[in-house]
């Protein structure tokens, strides 16, 4: 694949009602099974079809799960994660990191390569600055008329 | 559904090398945990070496040093390069595909399992 691979990183609280087979997606990570090399988040690996996640469409996969219930999911072990899960009760509210890739070349999936990504911030800067200077430079251009 | 086909068995001296192939069809998903199992006679099965479609590696103690695991995520391949390989290397390998823990009713893994093919030490 050519070209700087960047993810352009968005935060989300989901609020999913649990359905008759559960949440509806899997799960991946954790310290003893680390999903991404130096990362011990945990990350959806699947989201099954007719599932609550997927009739509620935003969870999608690659997407890093924060926090359960406002539970921290940071430096815990697999099964420790999902026994969150499993206690989370009926309602459960997800604090969820989604990934879009932004690169020059072809688009693989996501889920692969550097988690970080980068800060939203770090795209709408530039975004504005040259925005700004656009405008500048016409105001200056009717200015000459 | 799920298929893995291995390959790369075989019989091979003290020393030497082998390399295990495993090819998965289906729908198997971007994100998932790809890796190898062994299981001698009368033992349970055990993980040999893994490896994560986001690049993370896990290996067994006593193939550390010995067998690399890679996979081509175009091919939806897994690959275990043994070298230095002993006699108590000798066993059947599996391969198997992992998509995670299922948050559902049962909360189990979302697993599949090759045939398997045998190595041989001698």
């Known amino acids: 694949m050519n070209g700087r691979v960047d993810y352009l990183v968005t935060e989300e609280e989901i609020n999913l009602t649990r359905g008759p087979s559960g949440l509806g997606f899997n799960i991946v990570g954790g310290t003893d099974q680390q999903y991404v090399s130096n990362d011990s988040g945990i990350y959806v690996s699947r989201i099954k079809e007719n599932g609550a996640a997927a009739l509620d469409g935003r969870l999608q996969e690659g997407d890093k799960i924060l926090s359960v219930n406002g539970q921290d999911l940071k430096n815990l072990l697999h099964q420790d994660a999902v026994d969150l899960f499993r206690n989370a009760g009926y309602a459960v509210s997800l604090r969820v990191q989604h990934r879009l890739q932004v690169q020059n070349g072809p688009i693989g999936h996501r889920g692969e390569g550097d988690p970080s990504g980068i800060p939203i911030f770090m795209v709408l800067v530039p975004v504005f600055a040259l925005t700004m200077v656009a405008a500048w430079a016409f105001m200056r251009y009717r200015q000459q008329l | 559904q799920v298929q893995l086909v291995e390959s790369g068995g075989g019989l091979v001296q003290a020393g030497g090398s082998l390399r295990l192939s495993c090819a998965a069809s289906?729908?198997?998903?971007?994100?998932?945990?790809m890796g190898w199992y062994r299981q001698a006679p009368g033992k349970q099965r055990e993980l040999v070496a893994s490896?994560?479609?986001?690049?993370?590696?896990n290996y067994a103690d006593s193939v550390k040093g010995r067998f690399t695991i890679s996979r081509d995520n175009a091919k939806n391949a897994v690959y275990l390069q043994m070298n230095s390989l002993k006699p108590e290397d000798t066993t059947v390998y599996y391969c198997?595909?992992?998509?995670?823990?299922?948050?559902?009713?049962?909360?189990?893994?979302?697993?599949?399992w090759g045939r398997g093919t045998q190595v041989t030490v001698s």
């Open positions: 198997n595909l992992d998509r995670g823990t299922h948050l559902g009713d049962s909360f189990e893994r979302d697993d599949y």
């Open positions: 289906g729908s198997i998903g971007s994100i998932n945990i």
């Open positions: 490896i994560t479609s986001g690049g993370a590696t």
